[in-house]
């Protein structure tokens, strides 16, 4: 399955709108910041295209997830919200219909099941993380960077498979 | 690729200010923060402050906060760094520095330096 | 402010050798599980280039040969084997708080 030129404008804009949310400086925030431990071995170039795409699905589905709670629309501009949930919906279509194409249809190997799991994990911890920080500004401030640079890891995942094609 | 390109070499005299600049191109200037570092001859980096281009928002070290200003202009891609009330301490090579990883306040790429000489 | 202490000021490492540099902050510039410190390497008449993060992470396209370890107040950079283009100042750096500050620098020699 070749995943459409537009998915990668579309991670790049989603990147964009997560830059532009920004409502108050880290700067202030920096007792606040927080190791996720984000899973960056699930995302290493050692998976198949097949093993991969249920993995990113995963990790831009929990991000629609934490995005849409009742906290986070009142953490963020509405407007900016919107139009980032509008680019997240187009990139799960797309790895949906990649699935739907035959990829990753088989049987799931363990080591896909594995790496789900870690990143479902790892978005627990920030959930807890929230929750422990009351959704202060600076908590919300702490986990946009986080995601920031989680999904641009996994943005870099996606080009390195369109390139090997 | 990532770029940062600033002016030339500055010569003034004391109390007087300058204006150094630091063209970005091949990234998204307006979401990096962009930092800016003092190096005296033959000495250390000194940290001057920070600004971010896609509003303006700037954090400076105490020391520098009379002493230098920091803007951005977007639409040129362009950050800039005010120095006033020049003295013969602010003789240095400065340099703007690309914020790297987010939140982890690492410098990646950094320009050329702009040389200020203050002399009378 | 956090001062970050560097030793030595100079040592000349032979060919091949190991070159150990060490950071000390006056204060710990650790939290959550990241240590904010970073190392950078500044050759003459040349700007300074990233080679550390976070004390222990290698930047991309930095040579193997150098790794970053401490956690805390205490901080080392290791480059081994050391080769001839290694010859250059290294700065510690550290982000914990702010205002962000340097160390004063090590100079590498090659003998």
């Known amino acids: 399955c070749d995943l459409p030129q537009t998915h990668s404008l579309g991670s790049r804009r989603t990147l964009m709108l997560l830059a532009q949310m920004r409502r108050i400086s880290l700067f202030s925030c920096l007792k606040d910041r927080h190791d996720f431990g984000f899973p960056q071995e699930e995302f290493g170039n050692q998976f198949q295209k097949a093993e991969t795409i249920p993995v990113l699905h995963e990790m831009i589905q929990q991000i629609f997830n934490l995005f849409s709670t009742k906290d986070s629309s009142a953490a963020w501009d509405e407007t900016l919200l919107d139009k980032f949930y509008t680019e997240l919906y187009q990139q799960l279509n797309d790895l949906e219909a990649c699935v739907i194409q035959g990829v990753g249809v088989t049987e799931t190997p363990l080591m896909k099941e594995d790496s789900i799991l870690a990143v479902r994990k790892y978005f627990q911890r920030i959930t807890l993380y929230l929750k422990e920080k009351k959704y202060s500004p600076c908590a919300w401030e702490v986990v946009r960077a986080e995601i920031m640079r989680s999904f641009s890891l996994s943005t870099n995942l996606q080009e390195s498979l369109r390139s090997k094609e | 690729q990532v770029q940062l390109q600033e002016s030339g070499t500055v010569l003034a005299r004391p109390g007087a200010s300058v204006k150094m600049s630091c063209k970005a191109s091949?990234?998204?200037?307006?979401?990096?923060?962009m930092h800016w570092v003092k190096q005296r001859p033959g000495q250390g980096l000194e940290w001057i402050g920070v600004?971010?281009?896609?509003?303006?928002?700037?954090t400076y070290n105490q020391k520098f906060k009379d002493k230098a200003k920091l803007t951005a202009v977007t639409s040129a891609n362009t950050a800039y760094m005010e120095l006033s009330s020049l003295t013969n301490e602010d003789s240095a090579v400065y340099f703007c520095?690309?914020?790297?990883?987010?939140?982890?306040?690492?410098?990646?790429?950094w320009g050329q330096g702009t040389t200020v000489t203050v002399s009378s | 402010d956090i001062v970050l202490t560097q030793s030595p000021a100079s040592l000349a490492v032979s060919l091949g050798q190991r070159a150990t540099i060490s950071c000390r902050a006056s204060k710990s510039v650790s939290t959550s599980g990241h240590s904010y410190m970073h190392w950078y390497q500044q050759k003459p008449g040349q700007t300074p280039k990233l080679l550390i993060y976070?004390?222990?992470n290698l930047e991309s396209g930095v040579p193997a040969r150098f790794s970053g370890s401490g956690s805390g107040t205490d901080f080392t950079l290791n480059i081994h084997p050391v080769e001839e283009e290694d010859a250059a100042t290294y700065y510690c750096q550290h982000s914990g708080e702010l205002p962000f500050t340097f160390g004063s620098g090590t100079k590498l020699e090659i003998k």
């Open positions: 520095t690309r914020n790297y990883k987010y939140d982890y306040y690492t410098m990646d790429y």
């Open positions: 600004i971010y281009p896609g509003n303006g928002d700037t």
């Open positions: 976070l004390a222990s």
């Open positions: 091949g990234y998204s200037f307006t979401t990096y923060w």
